[in-house]
């Protein structure tokens, strides 16, 4: 139920990558505005994005306080210009979001190969340790800081002259692989959290190949 000139939000959806977390919903407002509230299961409601005509609300600042908590959000609908108005039950119209646990559900962003260095028949490939908006002691944590050994990287590599790929894994951000001397190789990496059941894998990084500026070669 609710007032005749407001409709409840629907399709509440969490969009989250590397903990940057936005709640989206429908419909586009016509003569109404929205306010969002967020809470942990045991916590108090905190209001965000007051009386907005947007259909999204950035909740990153709230969820990064404890990424292992489970959060619930709700979106209130108010008539534009009359935000004191309530539904027929004496409270504003609202809709609940699905529950969201950032540590288990945030999407893994596309990783980036930071560098590769060849020494003889070995190549060291380093994956950029992306900074997140999660803080500890006033500093921003990297993806590795947050996930620790729960996060692994899969490396795909192949000779530039051939299509046959090989793969290796690391639970750090570095790979040390054997290569054939005198051959150029291309590399791509993917982030994976094996313990998850959803949003387990990132998309592949852009391909980087030897003979381009990211690499370094030493005999």
């Amino acid at each position: 139920s609710g007032t005749t000139n407001t409709v409840a939000a629907y399709n509440l959806t969490w969009k989250s990558t590397n903990f940057k977390t936005i709640l989206e919903w429908e419909p586009k407002p016509v003569n109404q505005v929205y306010t969002v509230q967020i809470s942990t299961k045991s916590g108090d409601w905190k209001s965000k994005c007051f009386y907005t005509t947007d259909t999204e609300c950035d909740l990153t600042d709230e969820i990064v306080k404890d990424v292992k908590q489970t959060y619930l959000a709700r979106v209130f609908s108010y008539p534009a210009g009359n935000v004191e108005s309530t539904g027929s039950a004496g409270e504003p119209l609202y809709e609940n979001s699905p529950e969201f646990t950032p540590y288990l559900e945030t999407n893994l962003g596309q990783p980036t190969i930071q560098s590769f260095e060849q020494v003889g028949t070995k190549v060291n490939v380093t994956v950029e340790d992306e900074r997140t908006l999660v803080r500890r002691n006033n500093t921003f944590l990297s993806l590795r800081d947050v996930f620790g050994k729960d996060l692994i990287y899969t490396l795909y590599y192949w000779k530039s002259s051939s299509s046959g790929k090989k793969t290796a894994k690391t639970n750090t951000n570095e790979f040390l692989i054997d290569v054939d001397k005198g051959e150029n190789y291309c590399f791509s990496v993917q982030a994976v959290i094996p313990s998850r059941t959803v949003n387990r894998k990132s998309t592949d990084s852009p391909v980087e190949c030897m003979g381009q500026e990211k690499g370094e070669f030493r005999e």
């Epitope: 692994i152 899969t154 795909y156 790929k165 090989k166 793969t167 290796a168 894994k169 690391t170 692989i177 993917q190 994976v192 094996p194 313990s195 059941t197 959803v198 949003n199 387990r200 894998k201 998309t203 592949d204």
Partner: antibody, heavy 117, light 107 residues
Framework: EVQLVESGGGLVQPGGSLRLSCAAS????????MHWWRQAPGKGLEWVGL????????IYDPKFQDRATISADNSKNTAYLQMNSLRAEDTAVYYC??????????LGQGTLVTVSS | DIQMTQSPSSLSASVGDRVTITCRAS??????LNWYQQKPGKAPKVLIY???SLAEGVPSRFSGSGSGTDYTLTISSLQPEDFATYYC?????????AGQGTKVEIK
């Protein structure tokens, strides 16, 4: 409940081809890596290759690189193994497996391929 | 390719015995080592992953240890249902490779 069901095995002539299917239920194959293994009668486990169904990456044991093709149809939640130029030593039970990236947590029951004239 | 050498290839033991199976990799596999159990006519089943982690639903009498190139599977007190073939398997880099298996038989 997670299940993997292989099919497509049977008797194949030397020089012939096979196409095995691995139908998955209880999970989305795009979230995992899917592998194919085989085991010749009385022998150990031999890895054929893998696919990341979401990204399309495939990796093969070099000994199968020229004869094996692994693919996936995400809409059918099914992985496939095509092998060509079959010989007697390819006679084996072929298994598909779900890989979490930490381990293969589910394997199918296997499908027997016999290469004989 | 990484070679996995498993020993012994077979052993006879009695119920209640402590059983140890070893696996040696031809180079450091950084604990990307899993142990599988296989019974006749059945698919392999994971016991241990990352060298030391017990897979879900696996009895605590199974344990794994090791690092670098040398790994061990221990069954602290062999049960009747443990008579089977055991394989170690490395998954740190392709091609994935398995040991040749250890058949645990009743003495």
């Amino acid at each position: 409940e997670v299940q993997l069901v292989e099919s497509g095995g049977g008797l194949v002539q030397p020089g012939g081809s096979l196409r095995l299917s691995c139908a998955a239920s209880g999970f989305n194959i795009k979230e995992y890596y899917m592998h194919w293994w085989r085991q010749a009668p009385g022998k150990g486990l031999e890895w054929v290759g893998l696919i990341d169904p979401e990204q399309g990456n495939t990796i093969y044991d070099p000994k199968f690189q020229d004869r094996a093709t692994i693919s996936a149809d995400n809409s059918k939640n099914t992985a496939y193994l095509q092998m060509n130029s079959l010989r007697a030593e390819d006679t084996a039970v072929y298994y598909c497996a779900r890989d979490t990236a930490a381990y293969w947590d589910y394997l199918g029951q296997g499908t027997l391929v016999t290469v004989s004239s | 390719d990484i070679q996995m050498t498993q020993s012994p290839s077979s052993l006879s033991a009695s119920v209640g015995d402590r059983v140890t199976i070893t696996c040696r990799a031809s180079r450091d596999i950084k604990s990307y080592l899993n142990w599988y159990q296989q019974k006749p006519g059945k698919a392999p089943k994971v016991l241990i992953y990352y060298a030391t982690s017990l897979a879900e639903g696996v009895p605590s009498r199974f344990s794994g240890s090791g690092s670098g190139t040398d790994y061990t599977l221990t069954i602290s007190s062999l049960q009747p249902e443990d008579f089977a073939t055991y394989y170690c398997l490395q998954h740190g880099e392709s091609p994935w490779t398995a040991g040749q298996g250890t058949k645990v038989e009743i003495k």
